[in-house]
């Protein structure tokens, strides 16, 4: 059987991003997301 290993050779950086809820709706407060590899995932 073939063995598959994920070894991309580079590090994927992540960064916390914070948005104001009122920019996307009527709520107040902050929305915290996580950007991994250029994509906001949370």
């Amino acid at each position: 059987d073939a063995e598959f290993r994920h070894d991309s050779g580079y590090e994927v950086h992540h960064q916390k991003l914070v948005f104001f809820a009122e920019d996307v709706g009527s709520n107040k407060g902050a929305i915290i997301g996580l950007m991994v590899g250029g994509v906001v995932i949370a």
Epitope: F19, F20, E22, K28, A30
Partner: nanobody, 124 residues
């Protein structure tokens, strides 16, 4: 875009307080989320605090939470940073900046307009 001018910096003893102001020119002030950043000697520019377009929502860096308060007065096109319980590590050049709505408020690249900065020195 808006033009920004900070004031209120100075020398203060540890434990003291300062209030920074940032006056904005332009009729579109309330279209921008506003933030404060700081840059200590020999270090990078770091996020301090931000306030939403309406002034209702705020967000702070962990290092200043509970000590600093950001606010704005849209009738005066001005944003404020009240700094209490100042520490020597708060010594830095403080910059006011404006970010378009919908952009991440805690990262430098979101901010399209910057002031020239006002120097805060905390020393005994």
């Amino acid at each position: 875009e808006v033009q920004l001018l900070e004031s209120g910096g100075g020398v203060v003893q540890p434990g003291g307080s300062l209030r920074l102001s940032c006056a904005a020119s332009g009729r579109t002030f309330n279209n921008y989320n506003m933030g404060w950043f700081r840059q200590a000697p020999g270090k990078g520019r770091e996020f301090v605090a931000a306030v939403s377009r309406s002034g209702v929502s705020t967000y702070y860096a962990d290092s200043v939470k509970g000590r600093f308060t950001i606010s704005r007065d849209n009738s005066k096109n001005t944003v404020y940073l009240q700094m209490n319980s100042l520490r020597p590590e708060d010594t830095a050049l403080y910059y006011c900046a404006a970010a378009y709505r919908g952009t991440a408020i805690n990262v430098r690249r979101s901010y399209s307009s910057w002031g020239q900065g006002t120097l805060v020195t905390v020393s005994s």
